[in-house]
């Protein structure tokens, strides 16, 4: 007897973190042999949506015209052959940015550090926020992601730096979000060039590097050292 | 007992619209998927599309795709179908139908029907 | 679209008969079809499903069998409420498409 049918691929263009509005399109892609493909949403009853297979069959396109809330969550999809259905693939966590306006990124004491020395990357919103994250350009996860204690409600979050090295240059933005749905995510900061100076290193990245699927020194969590930041906020590396 | 309950008979003139409501009570509506079909005098049945309640995804028929509009009001627990540029050929019983998603995606409950005559 | 042919349209038949239907799909519908029992001036019902699944309520005499293109609808002993219009109906893909309908009458 036949093992179980191998899981789909699930996946979203341009990507999984949407701006409020924007399209987005969902690819399941299965086999030649599959008659349906069934997309289902995390607490959603019914199937979320079914879609007939594309030529020549193998996947099958779920359309979102204009991002909204009720879009953002948790997604995966089945696909139907003549022998029954596949196992569910890997979830797909659909982001929505735009939710909340956005927060302020600032460095203290300034963005210009120089190399040895400590900075803090200061994310502060204007209403109060469980959730704040740290995202650095071309950086393939989120730095750091600060959730607070018991829910409490904070208007900024600290992430520290120490000591600086030519990796922690380049452009960054913070989100703020609340902990009741992390699928949706403020409108980004402004960016913030963090400049290093005092090392011989190009403290940017270059533009033609690829992220390389291992996880180098741009995908780590940036360990600040010293206490837990002051504002109260519990610290999670992604 | 799951019950659909369908809006009244319509008369329309060539070129209008028409808008036929179906009632889900019984179970969890937004639950299952929901079925639009119509049956012409006479004739057989036609499938038009169907919704889901849930989230308001739909699929329509492609013979219908730039006429016919579903939507859905979770909060009465109905399911509309709209259908616009009406002609003759349009006269028809129309039937709500609920999926029952599992082996066959097969119609397991339906509406009583709603007459929609079309005629100048 | 899959295309549904029931035969045949009509056909007359006497209590207590055994009476078969059958149903072709354009392509291989891998089981995906269903059978419907519609009386004049009334919404369809649901009979069987899944080809050979008979719907909560309906009386046993009534049974589906086939696989790929070719479906039956088999009645084993005619009731005098079972005359009536029976039609097939692919789930197997969108657009979901039904068979013309086979008239059972009284002979």
């Known amino acids: 007897q036949a093992g179980p049918l191998p899981k789909p691929t699930l996946w979203a263009e341009p990507g999984s973190v949407i701006s409020w509005g924007n399209s987005v399109t969902i690819w399941c892609q299965g086999t030649l042999e599959a008659r349906e493909y069934r997309l289902d949403k995390e607490e959603s009853p019914a199937p979320w949506d079914r879609q007939n297979p594309l030529e020549p069959k193998n996947k099958a396109r779920f359309s979102i015209p204009s991002m909204t809330e009720d879009y953002a969550g948790r997604y995966r999809c089945y696909y139907r052959s003549p022998v029954g259905w596949s196992q569910p693939s890997d979830p797909l966590e659909l982001v929505m940015t735009g939710a909340y306006s956005k927060p302020t990124l600032s460095a203290l004491p300034s963005p210009l550090v120089t190399s040895g020395k400590s900075v803090t990357l200061l994310c502060q919103s204007r209403s109060p926020m469980d959730t704040f994250l740290l995202i650095k350009e071309r950086a393939a996860h989120p730095l750091l992601h600060l959730r607070s204690e018991h829910g409490a409600q904070q208007h900024q979050a600290e992430f520290p730096m120490s000591p600086v090295t030519s990796v922690h240059g380049g452009t960054y933005r913070c989100f703020s979000s609340h902990g009741f749905s992390h699928y949706l995510l403020s409108h980004p900061s402004d960016p913030l060039e963090l400049i290093v100076s005092g090392s011989l290193e190009d403290p940017r990245p270059s533009p033609t590097r690829s992220v390389s699927t291992a996880a180098g020194p741009e995908d780590q969590p940036l360990m600040p050292t010293g206490s837990v930041p002051h504002s109260g906020l519990r610290r999670h590396w992604e | 007992q799951v019950q659909l309950v369908q809006s009244g008979a319509e008369v329309k003139k060539p070129g209008a619209s028409v808008k036929v409501s179906c009632k889900a009570s019984?179970?969890?509506?937004?639950?299952?998927?929901m079925h639009w079909v119509r049956q012409a005098p006479g004739q057989g049945l036609e499938w038009m599309g169907e919704?889901?309640?849930?989230?308001?995804?739909?699929n329509y028929n492609e013979k219908f795709k730039s006429r016919v509009t579903m939507t859905r009001d979770t909060s009465t627990s109905t399911v509309y179908m709209e259908l616009s540029s009406l002609r003759s050929e349009d006269t028809a019983v129309y039937y709500c139908?609920?999926?029952?998603?599992?082996?066959?995606?097969?119609?397991?409950?339906w509406g009583q029907g709603t007459t929609v005559t079309v005629s100048s | 679209d899959i295309q549904m042919t029931q035969s045949p349209s009509s056909l007359s038949a006497s209590v207590g008969d055994r009476v078969t239907i059958t149903c072709r799909a354009s392509?291989?519908?891998?089981?995906?079809l269903n059978w419907y029992q519609q009386k004049p001036g009334k919404a369809p019902k649901l009979l069987i499903y899944y080809t050979s699944r008979l719907h909560s309520g309906v009386p046993s005499r009534f049974s589906g069998s086939g696989s790929g293109t070719e479906y039956t609808l088999t009645i084993s002993s005619l009731q005098p409420d079972d005359f009536a219009t029976y039609y097939c109906q692919q789930g197997d893909t969108l657009p979901r498409t039904f068979g013309q309908g086979t008239r059972l009458e009284i002979k």
């Open positions: 139908a609920r999926d029952r998603y599992d082996e066959g995606n097969a119609m397991d409950y």
């Open positions: 919704i889901n309640p849930s989230n308001g995804r739909t």
């Open positions: 392509q291989d519908i891998t089981n995906y």
């Open positions: 019984g179970y969890t509506f937004t639950s299952y998927w």
